[in-house]
Interface confidence: low
């Protein structure tokens, strides 16, 4: 069967198309091409007589058509009006006619698009922005790219106007990105230059750094303020409510206790009209803002009840501190047998009783800081056992025996098992 194939089917303006004939019959007298879906003398493009090899242009001939001996038709410099159907009329030697129709579509080569915007300076959480891809082109598909990736799914993003318009509702600073639009049709695809969406925001609540509150007299006070903002915030400092200077950083050398007070950073964005403040308290004091961890030393950690006494000493290198003692989460002293001396540095228990067995720790503190020691375990033994029943584990003494008179934690029992194996190995 006679058929026509258009190569290509979608043709760009200015290009060419070949209407290729398949299954052309033998013994032909001639053939003729017509614009449209039927044979119409008024719309004849060209006729060809095989015997004379003569091509005769018809009323629809434009000068851009070339007919080949195999009946195929080449149309050059395609224009929009060329789109549609073409009919080949074949006249056989027996004067029996045969027809076939083919078609192609013509599309424009798309121009490079550009983006127009209805709001070049949107404010965060307040404004919407509509981008429109220009120009409007028939039969074109519109696509959008954000940072060279396809549009994310978001309820704040809306495509309209045949995807030609992209609207961002309640813009956020994260919408500050590179936007491009792309136009596509079956013969071309063009992408716009990027447009940077500039979302105005802030200032956010300022942060004052460093975070230190306590300074020693004679130190330099250097504070820096930062608030996320677009355009960048303008900063000012107040001390105890009094304006000092309009800078991002505040520097006061050789501070004294008189520099203690409230330091306010004020951040202002003149474009959004918003401002935020943060207040920081600065304390200038000789006191140490960080008290070192104290250590407990014991005259002995395993004692005989109703017979021995014990001294616990809380060691610290800090000055200007106070000391308090704790036993099983209770503040000491808790009985007449317990005495504190040397400014609470030493806790003496005389004599030691069964109820004194357990964990002790001390705490050192000043008005602005405190720290506590690791606990120490006091074991009270009522059995007179030989010395070999005591073993040394990590420089602490634990009682080894099954009398059940010792207040020892499960964790220390495990350590004892490990230590006993070690102890026996060395004997």
């Amino acid at each position: 069967k006679l058929t026509i194939e258009s190569t290509p089917f979608n043709v760009a303006e200015g290009k060419e198309v070949l209407l290729l004939v398949h299954n052309l019959p033998q013994h032909l007298f001639g053939y003729s091409w017509y614009k449209g879906e039927r044979v119409d003398g008024n719309r004849q493009i060209i006729g060809y007589v095989i015997g004379t090899q003569q091509a005769t242009p018809g009323p629809a001939y434009s000068g851009r058509e070339i007919i080949y001996p195999n009946a195929s038709l080449l149309i050059q410099n395609i224009i929009q009006n060329d789109t549609g159907f073409y009919t080949l009329h074949v006249i056989k030697s027996d004067l029996v006619n045969e027809e076939a129709t083919g078609q192609f579509r013509v599309y424009p080569e798309l121009p490079k698009p550009s983006i127009s915007s209805n709001n070049s300076k949107p404010v965060e959480d307040k404004d919407a922005v509509a981008f429109t891809c220009e120009p409007e082109t028939q039969d074109a598909t519109y696509l959008w790219w954000v940072n060279n990736q396809s549009l994310p799914v978001s309820p704040r993003l809306q495509l309209s106007n045949g995807n030609r318009t992209l609207t961002l509702f309640n813009v956020t600073r994260n919408d500050s990105a590179s936007y491009k639009c792309e136009t596509q049709n079956p013969v071309s695809a063009r992408r716009s230059d990027s447009v940077i969406l500039n979302v105005l925001y802030g200032p956010d609540t300022p942060t004052i750094s460093p975070s230190d509150t306590y300074y020693r007299p004679g130190a330099n006070l250097s504070l820096s303020c930062y608030a996320a903002s677009n355009p960048p915030a303008q900063y000012s400092w107040l001390i105890n409510g009094t304006f000092q200077q309009s800078t991002q950083e505040l520097f006061i050398p050789n501070i004294t206790v008189n520099n203690s007070g409230s330091y306010t950073c004020h951040a202002n964005n003149s474009v959004t009209g918003c401002n935020r403040t943060t207040v920081k308290t600065i304390i200038v004091t000789e006191l140490s803002p960080v008290v070192a961890k104290p250590q407990i030393k014991a005259s002995k950690t395993t004692v005989t009840g109703d017979k021995d006494s014990v001294n616990l000493t809380c060691s610290t290198n800090d000055t200007g501190i106070s000391i308090r003692w704790f036993f099983k989460n209770q503040s000491l002293p808790s009985s007449e047998r317990m005495k504190l001396s040397q400014g609470n540095i030493t806790l003496s228990i005389n004599p030691v009783k069964r109820e004194d067995a357990g964990t002790y720790w001390c705490e050192v503190f000043n008005p602005i800081s405190k720290n506590q020691s690791d606990p120490i375990m006091l074991n009270v033994n009522y059995n007179a056992l030989p010395q070999e029943n005591l073993i040394n584990v990590d420089e602490q003494l634990y009682f080894q025996g099954g009398s059940g008179l010792n207040d020892i934690f499960e964790a220390q029992k495990i350590e004892w098992h490990e230590a006993r194996a070690h102890h026996h190995h060395h004997h």
Partner: nanobody, 119 residues
Framework: EVQLVESGGGLVQPGGSLRLSCAAS????????IGWVRRAPGKEEELVAA????????RYADSVKGRFTISADTSKNTAYLQMNSLRAEDTAVYYC????????????WGQGTTVTVSS
């Protein structure tokens, strides 16, 4: 997300030089114009230099012509401001800023780098 990060500021003596860098991410600098804006206490903000790769031109404020040079390295997506023969009046916070082809306002700014010219 579009980001501009400036660096290269510092303290320099009058007559000295500094080179500021502006590293851009989230877009291609060849698609837009990049400018250097300065802000000094008590003074108006001033666009001192701009470069538009896609238009192929640079421009300078009269106050810096012949002393400052703006350039861009599109392979590094970075813009530069070479500042020579610095004067005390050049002391300011210098911000890198983008102008979108939509509006040509230099309205997306980085967070700035401080230049202090003092003896």
């Amino acid at each position: 997300e579009v980001q501009l990060v400036e660096s290269g500021g510092g303290l320099v003596q009058p007559g000295g030089s500094l080179r500021l860098s502006c590293a851009a991410s989230g877009f291609n600098i060849k698609d837009t114009c990049i400018g250097w804006v300065r802000r000094a206490p008590g003074k108006e903000e001033e666009l001192v230099a701009a470069i538009c790769e896609y238009k192929g031109y640079t421009r300078y404020a009269d106050s810096v012509k012949g002393r400052f040079t703006i350039s861009a390295d599109t392979s590094k997506n970075t813009a530069y401001l070479q500042m020579n023969s610095l004067r005390a009046e050049d002391t300011a916070v210098y911000y890198c800023a983008i102008a979108s082809p939509v509006d040509q306002y230099y309205n997306y700014w980085g967070q700035g780098t401080t230049v202090t010219v003092s003896s």
